[in-house]
């Protein structure tokens, strides 16, 4: 791989607390690091067909670290796509231009030296402009395995023309079965996207009991589908301490 | 080479409807392109009016949205705009032109003029 | 809406530098593309993708893009090259695309 400049050309302030070199002494080694990591908190990239994909991983280290790119964990080669593609090393970028649908997947940005290795996915989907199902950033919601007491936040990201209704769910028991008569599983509604909800995509739970363990969902629907994603939260208390009861209302997922 | 070429009226009425199309030659517009119209009021700088893709899908400037309608007929490898309750503001060199991210193909442009 | 800035007017005496601006929120992580308009012409692209020269440009045309502001740079000014520059880019938030207002090049003597 060709080295990038050291410089980041997306780096306005000049905040690095490496030491400058001097003619005697030799840079002290730093580990690769995000440079703009705020540039990067967008993962789930939704794109119509033909336009131009850039992904950007802007980093530093020392010695200058080497920049590569994977397409769903595996390594990405210019012929693996028609047209190829560009890697702008001077800018840590990656460019696909005129996208087609075969373009979707997980792009994976690897930054490494000697002294370490960072690494960060792009989502990218290839979509028509015209209404669609609703898409979800993968991976999220996030597992989280919290102390009992604590407040817990579940985030769902989601792209979706027309405007999605959003809900928030848990998998419950009823009767010791966590599954209805009808072979669907029992659920609770949590939260549900109002007209103006604007927090919708996160759940927050507050001051977490043992009870509250379990898989939480994440429900996206439009009038064209649905999507949903879960997670699984996790509260650790002391041995000693009793079981809180449990309160429900049982609905049924379908 | 694509080539692109207005055609229609250059006087249309206030309150009235502008309707142009693009005949494309050299190219299928059916190809992995987007079909755009883009307008220049004299002496002034360049507008996106919309676009669209082979399949019907559209997207429209917003703030000319609720006049225009972008149409797209394969069998004749042309596209069409209509702009309606046109005024005097509307008087502009109406261009053509191909597109990805970038546009890479323009027709020669077509003046039109809004006046009673 | 997504705005791209300009300055209006950039001079340049033959055969010095000229560098038009846009600038726009975080531009550096959107696909700058830049176009010459000659009067009563058609606009034709010389930088697309930030800083590629569609075939048959002059490599005296360059781009470059970073943080807030996209640059053009025309080194070795000819009178030629007198037109108004515009830049574009599709914002991928709103899924328009926009042009900058436009820069008139005017090469001096």
């Known amino acids: 791989d060709a080295l990038p400049s050291s410089e980041d050309d997306d780096d306005d302030d000049d905040s690095s607390s490496e030491e400058k070199e001097t003619d005697n002494t030799k840079p002290n080694p730093v580990a690769p690091y995000w440079t703009s990591p705020e540039k990067m908190e967008k993962k789930l990239h939704a794109v119509p067909a033909a336009k131009t994909v850039k992904f950007k991983c802007p980093s530093s280290g020392t010695p200058n670290p080497t920049l590569r790119w994977l397409k769903n964990g595996k390594e990405f080669k210019p012929d693996h796509r028609i047209g190829g593609y560009k890697v702008r090393y001077a800018t840590w970028s990656i460019i696909m231009d005129s996208v087609v649908p075969s373009d979707k997947g997980n792009y994976t940005c690897i930054v490494e030296n000697e002294y370490g290795s960072i690494n960060h996915t792009y989502q990218l989907d290839v979509v028509e402009r015209s209404p669609h199902r609703p898409i979800l950033q993968a991976g999220l919601p996030a597992n989280k395995t919290v102390a009992l007491g604590s407040n817990v936040e579940f985030m769902c990201k989601v792209y979706s023309d027309p405007q999605p209704h959003i809900q928030w769910l848990k998998h419950i028991e009823v009767n010791g079965s966590k599954i209805g008569p009808d072979n669907l599983p029992y659920v609770q509604i949590l939260k549900h996207s109002g007209i103006n909800s604007s927090d919708a995509e996160v759940l927050t739970l507050f001051n977490v009991t043992e009870a509250q363990s379990g898989e939480y969902v994440c429900k996206v629907s439009n009038y064209i589908g649905e999507a949903n994603q879960s997670a699984w939260l996790t509260v650790t208390r002391p041995a000693l301490e009793e079981r809180p009861a449990v309160m429900t209302s049982p609905l049924y997922l379908e | 080479q694509v080539q692109l070429q207005e055609s229609g009226p250059g006087l249309v009425k206030p309150s009235g409807t502008l309707s142009l199309t693009c005949a494309v030659s050299g190219g299928s517009i059916s190809s992995n392109n987007w079909w755009s119209w883009v307008r220049q009021p004299p002496g002034k700088g360049l507008e996106w009016i919309g676009e669209i893709y082979h399949s019907g899908s559209t997207s429209y400037n917003p703030s000319l949205k609720s006049r225009v309608t972008i149409s797209v007929d394969k069998s004749k490898n042309q596209f069409s705009l209509k702009l309606s309750s046109v005024t005097a503001a509307d008087t502009a060199v109406y261009y053509c032109?191909?597109?990805?991210?970038?546009?890479?193909?323009w027709g020669q442009g077509t003046l039109v003029t809004v006046s009673s | 809406s997504y705005v791209l800035t300009q300055p209006p007017s950039v001079s340049v005496a033959p055969g010095q530098t000229a560098r038009i601006t846009c600038g726009g929120n975080?531009?550096?992580?959107?696909?700058v593309h830049w176009y010459q308009q000659k009067p009563g012409q058609a606009p034709v692209l010389v930088v697309y993708d930030d800083s590629d020269r569609p075939s048959g440009i002059p490599e005296r045309f360059s781009g470059s893009n970073s943080g807030n502001t996209a640059t053009l740079t025309i080194s070795r000014v000819e009178a030629g090259d007198e037109a108004d520059y515009y830049c574009q880019v599709w914002d991928s938030t709103s899924d328009h695309r926009v042009f900058g207002g436009g820069t008139k090049l005017t090469v001096l003597g």
């Open positions: 032109a191909r597109a990805t991210d970038w546009f890479d193909a």
């Open positions: 975080n531009i550096g992580s959107e696909s």
